[in-house]
């Protein structure tokens, strides 16, 4: 990511609903810290189209989200 | 049909104020964020202030922090980005945007994606010296 300045969250808004799989170039969770208390998902986009923020309740963040904790624990 | 309707754009001397609106319609509120961004001549289209309305949440590019405004008026659908202290340098067309998913790191050369991104015309702003 570029940088961030500490002490905020990086989503502005809930986030988007879903992203089609086949834009997905790759998903980063954020866990609650003290820059942020909630949970964040972010989607980088094929084709440099940029990043956006997956909605964390949406169905599809939820399996992102345990796809990653599986992956990692 | 969404439809974001800009308005308060004109001719100011440095130092003066304007307060642009932005009515928005055809789409649910909260589930956007709602913001203006600006586009000066052969210049990348920038995030300027942007506000989330289901929370409230704010956002501001360093260069207008402490001059500029942004508030909402959830009855009316309506954004507003009240502008003081403008400078020659905030001369540009400003667009009304409602999106989701923005990521605040990258709105400093903000990439507009179709499918999760609407716009308004836009309404030019001239700060002269």
């Known amino acids: 990511f570029p940088m961030f300045k500490r002490g905020r969250c990086l989503c502005i808004g809930p986030g988007v609903k879903a992203v089609k799989v086949a834009d997905i170039e790759k998903a980063s969770i954020m866990y609650p810290s003290n820059n942020c208390d909630k949970i964040e998902v972010i989607i980088t986009l094929k084709e440099n189209k940029g990043q956006r923020c997956l909605n964390p309740k949406s169905k599809q963040a939820r399996l992102i989200i345990k796809k990653v904790e599986r992956k990692n624990f | 049909e969404v439809q974001l309707v800009e308005s308060g754009g004109g001719l100011v001397q440095a130092g003066g104020s304007l307060r642009l609106s932005c009515a928005a319609s055809?789409?649910?509120?909260?589930?956007?964020?709602i913001g203006w961004f600006r586009q000066a001549p052969g210049k990348e289209r920038e995030g300027v202030s942007i506000?989330?309305?289901?929370?409230?949440?704010?956002y501001y590019a360093d260069s207008v922090k402490g001059r500029f405004t942004i508030s909402t008026d959830n009855a009316k659908n309506t954004v507003y980005l009240q502008m003081n202290s403008l400078k020659p340098e905030d001369t540009a067309v400003y667009y009304c945007?409602?999106?989701?998913?923005?990521?605040?790191?990258?709105?400093?050369?903000?990439?507009?994606?179709?499918?999760?991104?609407?716009w308004g015309q836009g309404t030019q702003v001239t700060v002269s010296s």
């Open positions: 945007a409602a999106g989701q998913g923005w990521v605040i790191a990258t709105m400093t050369s903000f990439r507009a994606h179709r499918e999760y991104d609407y």
């Open positions: 055809g789409f649910t509120f909260d589930d956007y964020a």
């Open positions: 506000i989330s309305s289901s929370d409230g949440t704010t």
